[in-house]
Interface confidence: low
Amino acid sequence: SERCDDWGLDTMRQIQVFEDEPARIKCPLFEHFLKFNYSTAHSAGLTLIWYWTRQDRDLEEPINFRLPENRISKEKDVLWFRPTLLNDTGNYTCMLRNTTYCSKVAFPLEVVQKDSCFNSPMKLPVHKLYIEYGIQRITCPNVDGYFPSSVKPTITWYMGCYKIQNFNNVIPEGMNLSFLIALISNNGNYTCVVTYPENGRTFHLTRTLTVKVVGSPKNAVPPVIHSPNDHVVYEKEPGEELLIPCTVYFSFLMDSRNEVWWTIDGKKPDDITIDVTINESISHSRTEDETRTQILSIKKVTSEDLKRSYVCHARSAKGEVAKAAKVKQKVPAPRYTVELACGFGAT
């Protein structure tokens, strides 16, 4: 067959769908690879062809669009399953072609089983809610396009295994779930089950997401440097190891890049000749406030090193701060024999 631009297997789009539920899968060509949409392609006389490779097989097969009740169908650039079966798992290819042009891409589709409490191998999106921030909502995701706007689905929300009814601060509002005041106790997996009728059949869409309650922007502050501080002096003799921790607290801020770095005499450690190592550790609170510790280490410090300026810097979306460590050379202990001898000899 003639050459075809093959985009390969697009593993970035590992699509997971639940067994026995409808699934609509758009051909990724138009979304990620080509600079034109399906309508343009169709009006230019290009045809979209679908085929697949079953799990653990190498043979490409055409998709059977003649199953009872049109279980699998194609509509424009969408492949429909009404509903999916477990053995629909495989790699699916959509190919756009005419006599002079051909482009194709494959993507993995995994049909996943869930238990009665909605547990499954499905990768769950995470939705962050601010703690004690007033009313916040999550929306049942990825249900657009499954039914026309005139069809009114019923939506049932669950937290874990339990239907959300008469919860103190969580109220189902159709496609939305409202949290009146989000608390740590609201952390968990939330599932919406959307039930809608179509051609005399009833279909269910199950969507689970993880809610994580995080620090509120109302409480957010610029970074706080706990160490170094004015109370601790790093007093070393030449030849000893110098260890200075920089410990910084960052309030949770959505999409903020938290940074910590050291400067030595105003330069980054990489830009100077001293043998310095920096080790970083990060810990999080329950509301995803972050504590970063960067330990600056000089194995064998020299008297020159002990005269340098060591400054810890921190930056977040809330601001930038810096704090110098108090480093000094330890005064040598008195050599008593010499001093005493001198003392007596002064008579």
């Epitope: 706007s149 005139s150 009114k152 019923t154 939506i155 929300w157 509002e173 159709g174 009728p197 179509e198």
Partner: antibody
Framework: EVQLEESGGDLVQPGGSLRLSCAAS?????????MCWVRQAPGKGLEWVSC?????????YYASWAKGRFTISRDNSKNTLYLQMNSLRAEDTAVYFC???????????WGQGTLVTVSS | DIVMTQSPSSLSASVGDRVTITCQAS??????LAWFQQKPGQAPKLLIY???TLASGVPSRFSGSGSGTEFTLTISSLQPEDFATYYC????????????FGGGTKVVIK
């Protein structure tokens, strides 16, 4: 011609019951997503009562005040919509319209209405 | 329940005037809003659905806009046959489907 025609309106005593019908002609119920009832008290505005999905599941929706007293149903073979009204009150006095909804065109087809009077 | 607040409740206008009627939903209803015209003794007639789509056979002087909670019906140049009462209908497509009409706006001759 595509049309809806209500019937069954009458004078009824408070606490009584009544069943309204709405016959569709010129189209099949199954081509309509929803069949609904709307009422209008004399000299007042429109008030939604209930809707039923035309597919086999027959999902029903009610205004909160109508739940428990009013029941919507349909007979696809007769192309007819019903509204069973129980425990009627004076404030239920109104013209009752049936309306159909297709493809997101909310209430694109209406009947002429039937008058229900609740009075002793 | 969802509440649709329509304003004004009545307005007087002349032929050729531009008329604007607003409707506010107590909840986010996306674009699930329709506008109707009703004349005395008649059933309502659908003018606009999905907030801005003109129903079949409706003159182009009628237009709708808005989404979420704020919606507007505009008659660009009022004609004699447009004197009537106008209603908005909001559809709250959530766990239990709720339809609600606005209180109506009566357009009378000035």
């Amino acid at each position: 011609e595509v049309q809806l025609e209500e019937s069954g309106g009458d004078l009824v005593q408070p606490g009584g019951s009544l069943r309204l019908s709405c016959a569709a002609s010129g189209f099949s119920f199954s081509s309509s997503y929803y069949m609904c009832w709307v009422r209008q008290a004399p000299g007042k505005g429109l008030e939604w009562v209930s809707c039923i999905y035309a597919g086999s599941s027959g999902v029903t929706y009610y205004a909160s005040w109508a739940k428990g007293r009013f029941t919507i149903s349909r007979d696809n073979s007769k192309n007819t919509l019903y509204l069973q009204m129980n425990s009627l009150r004076a404030e239920d006095t109104a013209v009752y319209f049936c309306a159909s909804e297709t493809d997101g065109n909310y209430f694109n087809l209406w009947g002429q209405g039937t008058l229900v009077t609740v009075s002793s | 329940d969802i509440v649709m607040t329509q304003s004004p409740s009545s307005l007087s206008a002349s032929v050729g005037d531009r008329v604007t009627i607003t409707c506010q939903a107590s909840e986010d209803i996306y674009s699930n809003l329709a506008w109707f015209q009703q004349k005395p003794g008649q059933a309502p007639k659908l003018l606009i659905y999905r907030a801005s789509t003109l129903a079949s056979g409706v003159p182009s002087r009628f237009s709708g806009s808005g989404s979420g909670t704020e919606f507007t019906l505009t008659i660009s140049s009022l004609q004699p046959e447009d004197f009537a009462t106008y209603y908005c209908l909001g559809v709250y497509t959530y766990s239990t489907d709720i339809h609600a009409f606005g209180g109506g706006t009566k357009v009378v001759i000035k």
